[in-house]
């Protein structure tokens, strides 16, 4: 039944960028200005998103796709489809409801967004701290203390330090 109905449904022939116009014997009419249809067979076109105020237009609306917005510099996108703009902070800070605040000792943030995260605990991997951490950078772990002791038969080169600060946003 479904297949029979779709074969008989003239609207299924209307491509993206058009709508099936009931007022005109179900012929395919182009989407009006400032509207779009991203799939075929639609009976209406959707209104284009308007990037107003601090939302800037990243991609213009077309007859087949909605506009895409981003945020004015100083803020960054948050939420699905950039539904919100959130304040940037400096590296070494995190955003709170009181504004941007410096990372506490023992934590860092190497980005303009996100939260301060604890420095890597090198000793958990049996390694020593090669470079101390800062508010902006994680510690760099070096060889284990045993590897550095005098008379050690062989010193293996330290494993490359992991790239810090790439936690999922």
């Amino acid at each position: 039944f479904e297949r029979t109905r779709s074969l008989q449904d003239p609207c299924s022939n209307c491509p993206a960028g058009t709508f099936c116009d009931n007022n005109r014997n179900q012929i395919c009419s182009p989407c009006p200005p400032n509207s779009f249809s991203s799939a075929g067979g639609q009976r209406t076109c959707d209104i284009c998103r308007q990037c107003k105020g601090v939302f800037r237009t990243r991609k213009e609306c077309s007859s087949t796709s909605n506009a895409e917005c981003d945020c004015t510099p100083g803020f960054h996108c948050l939420g699905a489809g950039c539904s919100m703009c959130e304040q940037d902070c400096k590296q070494g800070q995190e955003l709170t409801k009181k504004g941007c605040k410096d990372c506490c000792f023992g934590t860092f943030n190497d980005q303009k967004r996100g939260i301060c995260r604890p420095w890597t605990n090198c000793s958990l991997d049996g390694k020593s701290v090669l470079v101390n951490g800062t508010k902006e950078r994680d510690v760099v772990c070096g060889p284990s203390p045993a590897d550095l002791s005098p008379g050690a038969s062989s010193v293996t080169p330290p494993a490359p330090a992991r790239e810090p600060g790439h936690s999922p946003q």
């Epitope: 601090v54 948050l78 939420g79 539904s83 919100m84 703009c85 959130e86 304040q87 955003l95 709170t96 409801k97």
Partner: nanobody
Framework: EVQLVESGGGLVQPGGSLRLSCAAS????????MSWVRQAPGRGLEWVAN????????YYVDSVKGRFTISRDNAKSSLYLQMNSLRAEDTAVYYC????????????????WGQGTTVTVSS
């Protein structure tokens, strides 16, 4: 339609005062954190102040502390910014913005913004 409309901007001399207003409509104003954000000519956005749902929590950027006061009247669905001792560096477009659903828990995004009102501080 969810809307924020700012008013009260204008030209004022250094040391003068202005009171900005923001009229909210289309949503339950008293359920949301609200903020003022500004954009100086040729610069990025800068958060100025925010206020929680019942007005018991207010926070300010350091550069305006002691000079600006944020307030709200939930019965009138209105947000205000009293600006005293104005300086040339306060010249900017001032936006009223609504905090998103998760504001103050994990994210501080603002999802509804007004069109802005211009404040010019000049002698």
């Amino acid at each position: 339609e969810v809307q924020l409309v700012e008013s009260g901007g204008g030209l004022v001399q250094p040391g003068g005062s202005l009171r900005l207003s923001c009229a909210a409509s289309g949503f339950t104003f008293s359920n949301y954190w609200m903020s003022w954000v500004r954009q100086a000519p040729g610069r990025g956005l800068e958060w100025v102040a925010n206020i929680n749902q019942d007005g018991s929590e207010k926070y300010y950027v350091d550069s305006v502390k002691g000079r600006f006061t944020i307030s709200r009247d939930n019965a009138k669905s209105s947000l205000y910014l009293q600006m005293n001792s104005l300086r040339a560096e306060d010249t900017a477009v001032y936006y009223c913005a609504r905090g998103g659903e998760e504001y103050s828990s994990s994210h501080y995004g603002m999802d509804v913004w007004g069109q802005g009102t211009t404040v010019t501080v000049s002698s």
